[in-house]
């Protein structure tokens, strides 16, 4: 099979994942301890290999008794990291991942950082701030995103195969122009990534180039390929 023209284009439609912190300037805002603060859960997609900072509810330090981070990762015992203000003491239970740490000393900053984010960091992270007025929670459902590797090739006469390899979550594949496509295949890997494969055929001889467009939460990519001539075809007028 000769390798005919294959071009890559990375679209400009990428989602903004560079700023992997949801910590606003809210700590500088004096908050009334309203019931709204009592329980907040955030679903947060974060790209693998980036750094992430997770923050606690905006409670003034003087009102604090204990800060606890509870980390529940798939297939592992719950890890807790706590800090007691009165004794200036930190404690960890079942925490073995050295990439998950306090941003600085907890008396300075209660935020948690993941440096860098790995696929195993999918899970639930919760900050519990104990105060004389009660406990205030902020939870994160962290979804680690993995950019798929995109490939496109012509397998046989006017049939092209587009693969989005090892993405998380699964990518979506579309074609320009639409072809006669087999059902999309998905292959699930043990680490939670998915390979998606789309195979399409174009009967019309006026189709010169086909474009495979891969949509993913980490950004969109397109590849295009000029189809080879049908064997035996010599000359045609369009």
């Amino acid at each position: 099979q000769s390798n005919n023209s294959l071009m890559l284009q990375t679209s400009k439609e990428n989602h903004t994942l560079a700023s992997n912190s949801l910590c606003m300037d809210e700590k500088q805002i004096t908050q009334n301890h309203s019931k709204v603060l009592a329980e907040v859960n955030i679903s947060w997609p974060v790209q693998m290999a980036r750094n992430a900072v997770l923050c606690c509810p905006p409670i003034e330090f003087r009102n604090l008794i204990v800060i606890t981070w509870e980390i529940i990762l798939r297939g592992q015992p719950s890890c807790t990291k706590s800090y007691r203000k009165e004794t200036n003491e930190t404690k960890e239970t079942n925490c073995t991942d050295e990439r998950i740490t306090w941003v600085s000393t907890p008396d300075q900053n209660s935020d948690l950082q993941i440096h860098p984010v790995a696929i195993t960091h999918d899970g639930y992270y919760r900050c519990i701030m104990a105060t004389p007025d009660g406990n205030f929670h902020r939870g994160y459902h962290l979804q680690v995103l993995v950019t798929p590797e995109v490939t496109l090739f012509e397998s046989r006469n006017r049939t092209a195969v587009c693969k989005a390899v090892a993405g998380k979550p699964a990518a979506q594949i579309s074609w320009i122009p639409a072809g006669d496509c087999a059902p999309t295949e998905q292959e699930y890997w043990g680490n939670g990534t998915v390979t998606v494969k789309s195979t399409c055929h174009w009967e019309g001889h006026n189709v010169s180039t086909v474009t495979c467009h891969v949509s993913h939460l980490t950004g969109n990519k397109s590849l295009y390929i000029e189809l080879l001539p049908v064997p035996g075809a010599k000359k045609s007028a369009k």
Epitope: Q9, I176, V207, S222, K234
Partner: antibody, heavy 114, light 107 residues
Framework: QVQLQQPGSELVRPGASVKLSCKAS????????MHWVKQRPGQGLEWIGN????????NYDEKFKSKAKLTVDTSSRTAYMQLSSLTSEDSAVYYC???????WGQGTLVTVSA | DVQMIQSPSSLSASLGDIVTMTCQAS??????LHWFQQKPGKAPKLLIS???NLEDGVPSRFSGSRYGTAFTLTISSLEDEDMATYFC?????????FGGGTKLEIK
Amino acid sequence: QVQLQQPGSELVRPGASVKLSCKASGHTFTSYWMHWVKQRPGQGLEWIGNIYPGSGSINYDEKFKSKAKLTVDTSSRTAYMQLSSLTSEDSAVYYCLTMTGTSWGQGTLVTVSA
Amino acid sequence: DVQMIQSPSSLSASLGDIVTMTCQASQGTPINLHWFQQKPGKAPKLLISGASNLEDGVPSRFSGSRYGTAFTLTISSLEDEDMATYFCLQFTYIPWTFGGGTKLEIK
């Protein structure tokens, strides 16, 4: 780095023929379609046709099928376009292009004049 | 054949302006395209391949985007050297077809 070399200009008589060349380097010549495009002075661009050097397969735009003839010589990595029965309407710059239209030659100016 | 409708055919803008031009395939046919810049007496220069991919060496003020079946070339801050004619090329269907061009002049 793909390069397509074309002669700068050709002066031909009305009714005559001319064979334009396009010598390729920097890529697998037989694996990429070669296209030809026409641009008349101060006007838009028109696609003439394409040829696949690996098999000799050719497509022509209907408008150019009796005007242009595309050929290749794989040993010299050169594509050719012969234009016949030339008139003043054929005076134009002719470009060859490959790699799905991302690599262009500098163009050959064909002037048809008595 | 797929006709490429390009607009405007000409435009005049000041240095520093944001400039946009559009190409759309007839009947809203889904296609892919390239954007080129051409200066008098020169061969077309590829700016954007495959609708949105900025070519090496092309200033970052140029960008391409797709909105459904419409394609836009944007110059974020116009410079003197951008005075040229711009055109699109659809390469999905044979025959390949070009937009009519947008002649950009500096005010």
